[in-house]
């Protein structure tokens, strides 16, 4: 992937739109949308000041860990859906899109240098463990996906892209 492709706001917006669509199709869906287990996902809440004051390398650690955990969670959701007796087609489609989207975002972040950034800061080893919550429905899973993109990921790329411009 081109190193700074994710710095084009339209790129992130595309994935964000997909995540919101996925969240919307699960609104009011009970029957097909239970995960039947609790899946660990990143906590997407952001204390805006605290986040902005973080070193960009520390932000990278949190985004990288969050993205890895979220990818794992969506893959688990996909496996549960495949194993269900009658997977609901629209849900299957959006789960597959989310898996693909998270893979692409991982590639784009790697190209931006997020992985390198996440390994290099001296305080990376002493970083606070990633805060997590659980999702028991696809709606919650997609909401976490959407919030992660709107929050930590967008804030991090904004900062990393600006730093790269200097």
């Amino acid at each position: 992937a081109p190193p700074r492709l994710i710095c084009d706001s339209r790129v992130l917006e595309r994935y964000l739109l997909e995540a919101k669509e996925a969240e919307n199709i699960t609104t009011g869906c009970a029957e097909h949308c239970s995960l039947n287990e609790n899946i660990t996902v990143p906590d997407t809440k952001v204390n805006f000041y605290a986040w902005k004051r973080m070193e960009v390398g520390q932000q990278a650690v949190e985004v990288w860990q969050g993205l890895a955990l979220l990818s794992e969670a969506v893959l688990r959701g996909q496996a549960l859906l495949v194993n269900s007796s009658q997977p609901w087609e629209p849900l299957q489609l959006h789960v597959d899109k989310a898996v693909s989207g998270l893979r692409s975002l991982t590639t784009l972040l790697r190209a931006l240098g997020a992985q390198k950034e996440a390994i290099s800061p001296p305080d990376a080893a002493s970083a606070a463990p990633l805060r997590t919550i659980t999702a028991d429905t696809f709606r919650k899973l997609f909401r976490v996906y959407s919030n992660f993109l709107r929050g930590k990921l967008k804030l991090y790329t904004g900062e990393a892209c600006r730093t790269g411009d200097r």
């Epitope: 809440k45 952001v46 204390n47 805006f48 000041y49 605290a50 004051r53 709107r150 929050g151």
Partner: antibody, heavy 117, light 107 residues
Framework: EVQLVQSGAEVKKPGESLKISCKGS????????IGWVRQMPGKGLEWMGW????????RYSPSFQGQVTISADKSISTAYLQWSSLKASDTAMYYC??????????WGQGTLVTVSS | SYVLTQPPSVSVAPGKTARITCSGD??????AYWYQQKPGQAPVLVIY???KRPSGIPERFSGSNSGNTATLTISRVEAGDEADYYC??????????FGGGTKLTVL
Amino acid sequence: EVQLVQSGAEVKKPGESLKISCKGSGYSFTSYWIGWVRQMPGKGLEWMGWIDPYRSEIRYSPSFQGQVTISADKSISTAYLQWSSLKASDTAMYYCARVSSEPFDSWGQGTLVTVSS
Amino acid sequence: SYVLTQPPSVSVAPGKTARITCSGDKLGDHYAYWYQQKPGQAPVLVIYDDSKRPSGIPERFSGSNSGNTATLTISRVEAGDEADYYCATWTFEGDYVFGGGTKLTVL
């Protein structure tokens, strides 16, 4: 002790300009942001915007964008809120507050601005 | 723009528990903050990051936040707790939004 001291009350006429100040002491001024909050008579709190004096980054509430200007002079640990043309509806108490991980954790005493013809 | 809604008033007898609510679309996805303002005074932060208390705030003050609602709970209410209470939150974009405020009356 963290202190934010605001400039005194102002009485102005519609159309006049005004700049009020907020001086921080007892802490590193550039290590925190300063936020501005409006409280109209008998009403609630309204966030106007914040400034990061270190990076000179400013964010305005959509309701106040274009209506006021927020600035800071880090050399004298002071933040400012200014109007180029006051309206009667700008009559209110204006508070500055320090923004930290505990947002708006220390407040100024407030500056009462009265705009009347 | 994001909107936070609070009840205009809440009444409670001394020694009882007061609960003040704040609702907003998916508010549980954001941190909630609570301020106390007494007449003629500047506001004071009483709860941050949903449930944390700044130093100097009594343990009687607690907070929770999930779904669309954040709640400030004041246990063993005292006459000195009578004040206006405001909730607030950060948006992902960096805006800080205040609720309309709730007047707490101690009967």
